[in-house]
């Protein structure tokens, strides 16, 4: 039940304006925030009790300003956070400490970005600096996607510092993308 929510609030240089599908899951690792914490709660459905079609992603719309250091977009952008229950809980209760263990095999369905869109934004900077034009890449839609166990394991490598300090009784939750990471991905549109 952890692994379901993906978030992409990174602003990235993109090849051209318009909508385009997600990169392959292997590439997705560095572009999403994979929240893998379960919370030590029992799975809410017996394993494999529902057809996958009965599960549904949530597409949550947020409005925010794009920032690059002290500069901020003149207008806010709207993007999606992908979150939701894409399949039955694939975790087994761990009798000690109410933790969770991964079921070792089988497909894993996750709610991840499906399509992205590019948007040109104008960044206004303090101190009379000239405005900067940028293109940003924003999540435009979400979908439940079947990922293999291999993808799960490869994503463990990207958990970062917080994985070393998991909260008591909970699976480690990866740290969100830092402002520095976002900043590095803001490129001049021209």
């Amino acid at each position: 039940q952890g692994w379901q929510a993906f978030k992409n609030d990174a602003t990235e240089i993109i090849p051209e304006l318009g909508e385009y599908p997600e990169p392959p899951p292997e590439l997705e690792n560095n572009k999403t925030m994979n929240r893998a914490e379960n919370g030590g709660r029992p799975p809410h459905h017996p394993f494999e009790t529902k057809d996958v079609s009965e599960y549904s992603c949530r597409e949550l719309h947020f409005t925010r300003y794009v920032t690059d250091g002290p500069c901020r977009s003149a207008k806010p952008v709207t993007e999606l956070v992908c979150s939701g229950q894409c399949g039955p809980a694939r975790l087994l209760p761990n009798a000690i400490g109410r933790g969770k263990w991964w079921r070792p095999s089988g497909p894993d369905f996750r709610c991840i970005p499906d399509r992205y869109r590019a948007q040109r934004v104008q960044l206004l900077c303090p101190g009379g600096e000239a405005p900067r034009a940028r293109k940003v890449r924003l999540v435009a839609s979400c979908k439940c996607k079947r990922l293999t166990r291999f993808h799960n394991q490869s994503e463990l490598k990207d958990f970062g510092t917080e994985a070393a300090r998991p909260q008591k009784g909970r699976k480690p939750r990866p740290r969100a993308r830092s402002a520095k990471a976002n900043q590095a991905e803001l490129e001049n549109a021209y």
């Epitope: 809410h44 925010r64 969100a176």
Partner: antibody, heavy 120, light 107 residues
């Protein structure tokens, strides 16, 4: 343990504004949304809006678009809601709540509520 | 916006009774239905999330069920400490919306 500590009760004049705070502790602030909910005396719960503290992204209930402004300060793990142009209709208890959007898809921890009374 | 309807605003029952509180959404909410408990002048507490999952510490006499647009909360053996108002909430899409609440009282 997870806690959301809200600021104290406010008695304010009509036409003024008030800023309610919600200090989070016991978890990583940027990994959860903060939702705000209004409850008038003897009434139900009304969703005001949500902020994603990681990047300041917000979504407002249309009814509160011109009334509430949500912000978050990651350095102090505190979320704020500013209510402006107050009228007697704004007299209510305001709750902040944490949404675990990765596992629970619900508001799993709530603040104790802040009572705002608008009176001349 | 998705409307959430709790048709019963108050419900009177005896201790030990089995009580069911119903909630209807104006459109399919794909099981993103949560139940909250609020005791008089008290804080709000999440009881059940995603239709049927009990949060930690909630007694097993509470259960949730439903799908599509129709959901219910059942208390199998009513206890004095269950006297409260219960709200359903859809978490499928913004703006999140709550039912008007069902106040549970002892006969």
């Amino acid at each position: 343990q997870v806690q959301l500590q809200q600021s104290g009760a406010e008695l304010v004049r009509p036409g003024t504004s008030v800023k309610v705070s919600c200090k989070a502790s016991g978890y990583v602030f940027i990994n959860y949304f903060i939702e705000w909910v209004k409850q008038r005396p003897g009434q139900g719960l009304e969703w005001i809006g949500v902020i994603n503290p990681e990047n300041g992204g917000t979504n407002y209930n249309e009814r509160f678009k011109d009334k509430a402004a949500l912000t978050a300060d990651t350095s102090s793990s505190t979320a704020y809601m500013q209510l402006s142009s107050l009228t007697s209709d704004d007299s209510a208890v305001y709750f902040c709540a944490r949404e675990d959007y990765g596992d629970v898809y619900a508001m799993d921890y709530w603040g104790q509520g802040t009572s705002v009374t608008v009176s001349s | 916006d998705i409307q959430m309807t709790q048709t019963t605003s108050s419900l009177s029952a005896s201790l030990g009774d089995r009580v069911t509180i119903r909630c209807r959404a104006s459109q399919d909410i794909s099981n993103y239905l949560n139940w909250y408990q609020q005791k008089p002048d008290g804080p709000v507490k999440l009881l059940i999330y995603y239709t049927s999952t009990l949060t930690s510490g909630v007694p097993s006499r509470f259960s949730g069920s439903g799908s599509g647009t129709d959901y219910s909360l059942t208390i199998s053996n009513l206890d004095q400490e269950d006297i409260a108002t219960y709200f359903c909430q859809q978490g499928k899409t913004f703006p999140f919306t709550f039912g008007s609440g069902t106040k549970l009282e002892i006969k």
